[in-house]
């Protein structure tokens, strides 16, 4: 799996999760969540050569006529798989509220 | 939705389903197929700018961090939201077999 | 320059519907929380809602709970907030607003208001 | 909820002069979490101060905050004519966000 665990731990150049620290105020302008300041939000990248990790029937067939289409600009492309959630402190006025955005942290990659 | 009734119709530069025929022989070098010779697969090209048809929190959040980092390599991807399947003829021996192979045609793609 | 453009005000008979719409302009617009607050004729300013973009955390004033919904479409830079089951005490100019950043904040731009006439 | 009660409900003063506008609060806000906001007819209400104390951008020097905990000012040194108009106070330490019921400026 293009996950973290193999990703971080080796200089693969084709689809990955890549490491992306975010900084609530100064990359996204929020000034609303209290904590944390920021977080690793990490990305996908690399390319999607035949076969990569390919998600569905459709992305392996794009993949081979990539290969048989070297010059051609429609091919996979290296996307997020599994998605975590990331707890925050934001303050409403002068109560701290607890929540859970879904969907925020980037675990896994794969080429659809 | 960023669908064939939409992408096909105009000429939007941003994130859309773009219309690509592969030819099984020529594309793929499948032999193996009778009917179709080939199909409409399409695929899916163009920029994911903030906030073009974002599909998770995290590709909202990575679109908005990239317009406060316009030189980030870090950017949401065009790739595939509903596929169709393609039903084909193939032999097996002298036998015609009919079989639909799922997830084939891309019909909607979205920024990921 | 940061802009705020509210429409959608009209005359409407009581246990209708209405859906009024914030154009945000010259910023992030997913950067800021997001209010509606409106003044009936005559009156002073009451707050309705508010809307953090992208998180879609909103919250209401009571008088409009389960009324009122609030929402906003990011790629469209644009804030709503569909008023349902409308009473004649609903009434008001609506405007909307974008705090300094904080959820409850000063709120430093404002559209130039919607008129809502809630009357049989 | 938090009453915010304004006083005087209006004040007739004479371009040149000060003018003093006060706001309390039902229960303490600490002292940074309230705004002041002017309204002229016809017109969205214009952010003055936030935080209490703080001048928004582009507000003239004469506008001018204080207070903390339950009782806020809102002073105007030397009035002009186009200050003259409804002022409005609010809290945003708790949930709901609440206005003061406003003090109308005009010219004596």
């Known amino acids: 799996a293009l996950d973290t665990n193999y990703c971080f731990s080796s200089t693969e150049k084709n689809c990955c999760v890549r490491q992306l620290y975010i900084d609530f105020r100064k990359d996204l302008g929020w000034k609303w969540i209290h904590e944390p300041k920021g977080y690793h939000a990490n990305f996908c990248l690399g390319p999607c050569p035949y076969i990569w990790s390919l998600d569905t029937q459709y992305s392996k067939v794009l993949a081979l006529y990539n290969q048989h289409n070297p010059g051609a600009s429609a091919a996979p492309c290296c996307v997020p798989q599994a998605l975590e959630p990331l707890p925050i402190v934001y303050y409403v006025g002068r109560k701290p509220k607890v929540e859970q955005l879904s969907n925020m942290i980037v675990r896994s990659c794969k080429c659809s | 939705a960023l669908d064939t009734n939409y992408c096909f119709s105009s000429t939007e530069k941003n994130c859309c389903v773009r219309q690509l025929y592969i030819d099984f022989r020529k594309d793929l070098g499948w032999k193996w197929i009778h009917e179709p010779k080939g199909y409409h697969a399409n695929f899916c090209l163009g920029p994911c700018p903030y906030i073009w048809s974002l599909d998770t929190q995290y590709s909202k959040v990575l679109a908005l961090y990239n317009q406060h980092n316009p030189g980030a390599s870090a950017a949401p991807c065009c790739v595939p939201q509903a596929l169709e399947p393609l039903p084909i003829v193939y032999y097996v021996g002298r036998k015609p077999k009919v079989e639909q192979l799922s997830n084939m045609i891309v019909r909607s793609c979205k920024c990921s | 320059d940061v802009q705020l453009v509210e429409s959608g005000g009209d005359l409407v008979k009581p246990g209708g519907s209405l859906r009024l719409t914030c154009v945000a302009s010259?910023?992030?617009?997913?950067?800021?929380?997001m209010h509606w607050v409106r003044q009936a004729p005559g009156k002073g300013l009451q707050w309705v809602a508010y809307?953090?973009?992208?998180?879609?955390?909103?919250y209401y004033a009571d008088s409009v709970k389960g009324r009122f919904t609030i929402s906003i479409d990011n790629s469209k830079n644009t804030l709503y907030l569909q008023m349902n089951s409308l009473k004649t005490e609903d009434t008001a100019t609506y405007y909307c607003?974008?705090?300094?950043?904080?959820?409850?904040?000063?709120?430093?731009?404002w559209g130039q208001g919607t008129l809502v006439t809630v009357s049989s | 909820e938090t009453v915010l009660t304004q006083s005087p409900g209006t004040l007739s003063l004479s371009p040149g002069e000060r003018a003093t506008l006060s706001c309390r609060a039902s229960?303490?806000?600490?002292?940074?979490?309230l705004a002041w906001y002017q309204q002229k007819p016809g017109q969205a209400p214009r952010l003055l101060i936030y935080?209490?104390?703080s001048r928004a951008p582009g507000v003239p020097a004469r506008f001018s905050g204080s207070g903390s905990g339950t009782d806020f000012t809102l002073t105007i040194s030397s009035l002009e004519p186009e200050d003259f108009a409804v002022y409005y106070c609010?809290?945003?330490?708790?949930?709901?966000?609440?206005f003061g019921q406003g003090t109308k400026l005009e010219i004596k």
């Open positions: 010259g910023y992030t617009f997913s950067s800021n929380v």
């Open positions: 809307v953090i973009p992208i998180v879609d955390i909103a």
């Open positions: 229960q303490s806000l600490g002292s940074s979490y």
């Open positions: 607003a974008r705090t300094l950043g904080l959820v409850l904040d000063a709120m430093d731009y």
């Open positions: 609010q809290q945003y330490a708790d949930s709901p966000i609440t």
């Open positions: 935080g209490a104390s």
